[in-house]
Amino acid sequence: ALSPCESQPCQHGGQCRHSLGRGGGLTFTCHCVPPFWGLRCERVARSCRELQCPVGIPCQQTARGPRCACPPGLSGPSCRVSRASPSGATNASCASAPCLHGGSCLPVQSVPFFRCVCAPGWGGPRCETPSAAPEVPEEPRCPRAACQAKRGDQNCDRECNTPGCGWDGGDCSLNVDDPWRQCEALQCWRLFNNSRCDPACSSPACLYDNFDCYSGGRDRTCNPVYEKYCADHFADGRCDQGCNTEECGWDGLDCASEVPALLARGVLVLTVLLPPEELLRSSADFLQRLSAILRTSLRFRLDARGQAMVFPYHRPSPGSESRVRRELGPEVIGSVVMLEIDNRLCLQSAENDHCFPDAQSAADYLGALSAVERLDFPYPLRDVRGEPLEAPEQS
């Protein structure tokens, strides 16, 4: 069989390197020549957010688009051409792709004219040696026998909260089987919570590396001075510019009445452990906080009668239910909430490449936050999922 790079998948002069896929098989990574980027270097960077300059080299937005601001003595789109040696093609330079196992090459001005920044789990001058404690690509199975009995019991057991244990059978990930299942790059689940930009994990499939690669990262939160105010004034029909930011939930689109809706595919379905009437009483706060977490606009999906699709969620009957309880009807212990994601402002913002294209990717992100214990949301969520729009309506 052809090795992945033999099919020359990288466009526009991008360099193909072999890397290990999530299932342990061989896959490829393209190292693109600016201004190209993407899985196969098929996209053209239009902002510094999209341009991958070598580590340590800043990006500069110019009238002709973004470019890497090369240090003195280096030039070229990736700053890999030494001005002293126009070819820049000494065997030891970055042009020869000396860094192995997905490491990035940083040109330097002293011999050997490069420095490797290695991927997690690798070290050495060319990232050729596994580091002292190589990170296991993924635990193949759940190591603790006890976890098997605990999975699916609606309790997040921290000792079972690992990929191998399926995030305690979904108990720790809002019942999302594997939030990172679409992510090609290894270890992104480990890097999700490190507050550092990991470019290999910044794709939509890898849940945008928890927004670590965007200005201010995920630490850019709604100003606490504004937060209560923004919840009170969310979707109140009055444009509050202080709340009209992605981290404050876009003011419930109060400032976007002239902008056409851009709905993500599908419906985001949440099970919240609050009965419908209680949830609806604080729906502005609920939607504002969730919009702020997802950095886009959320709203209730409406049924044919124009009513918000918030349905009672009943306690699953264990069979040993008392006769009195059965006569009263099933106990309502929560709400099933159907939400639409409106990306109209997310896609208009300067960093418009981190919007959730569909409800399932938003569900995966919420599941990932929950799995790494970073879901700062005061409403008790039981599970979350994306459903296609054609899903039959609940009566």
């Epitope: 979707a235 109140d236 029909g237 009055r238 729906s283 502005a284 209730f300 009513q307 918000a308």
Partner: antibody, heavy 119, light 107 residues
């Protein structure tokens, strides 16, 4: 053109009930926050309450003097806003206006409907 | 609740006069203040929103200023059609509240 027309006002005894309607036309009613404002004869304006769009839960807020007695609702299929007034008092006598809220504020008001509470 | 206090409660002025009406909030409302004009038997009409923004279609002789607790509505040169009652209103927090009104009469 954009229009709001209130109806349902009239004479009612103290303790009685009345339901006001506000028919909207010329705009997508379902997406707007709607308000009720009243004005007692010869007096100033008093905010009664508001209702958000159903896409945000149709949350209502009320002024203290009417809380627990008045209920604001909406029927988006009929493009109509309602004010259900129970346990009416003489001090509820006023012209009641419905108004549309948006980013540039309540730019559309109805002509008002008079409610008289008297024995 | 936030109390809104307008002054004066009434004033007499002539055509061409410069008229100033003030409004004070019992607590800071940032710039969340609107000014309305109302003529007898008519619905109120919005003049100024967010303290200083002129609503479209409103003549430029009307202007608003202030933030925090103290606000001003100014009519630079009073016209015959400006004789009316003017109300300030805060929409910083529910319940939204109006000032008691200022009646501008012909001298």
């Amino acid at each position: 053109q954009v229009q709001l027309v209130e109806s349902g006002g009239g004479l009612v005894k103290p303790g009685g009930s009345l339901r006001l309607s506000c028919a909207a036309s010329g705009f997508t009613f379902s997406t707007y926050v709607m308000h009720w404002v009243r004005q007692a004869p010869g007096k100033g304006l008093e905010w009664v309450g508001r209702i958000r769009s159903n896409t945000y839960g149709g949350i209502t807020d009320y002024a203290a003097p009417v809380k627990g007695r008045f209920t604001i609702s909406r029927d988006d299929s009929k493009n109509t806003l309602y004010l259900q007034m129970n346990s009416l008092k003489t001090e509820d006598t006023a012209v009641y206006y419905c108004a549309r809220a948006e980013a540039r504020y309540r730019d559309v008001w109805g002509q008002g409907t008079l409610v008289t509470v008297s024995s | 609740d936030i109390q809104m206090t307008q002054s004066p409660s009434s004033l007499s002025a002539s055509v061409g006069d410069r008229v100033t009406i003030t409004c004070r909030a019992s607590q800071s409302i940032s710039s969340h203040l609107n000014w309305y004009q109302q003529k007898p038997g008519k619905a109120p009409k919005l003049l100024i929103y967010a303290a200083s923004n002129l609503q479209s279609g409103v003549p430029s002789r009307f202007s608003g200023s202030g933030s925090g607790t103290d606000f001003t509505l100014t009519i630079s040169s009073l016209q015959p059609e400006d004789f009316a009652t003017y109300y300030c209103q805060q929409d910083y927090h529910t319940p939204f509240t109006f000032g008691q009104g200022t009646k501008v009469e012909i001298k």
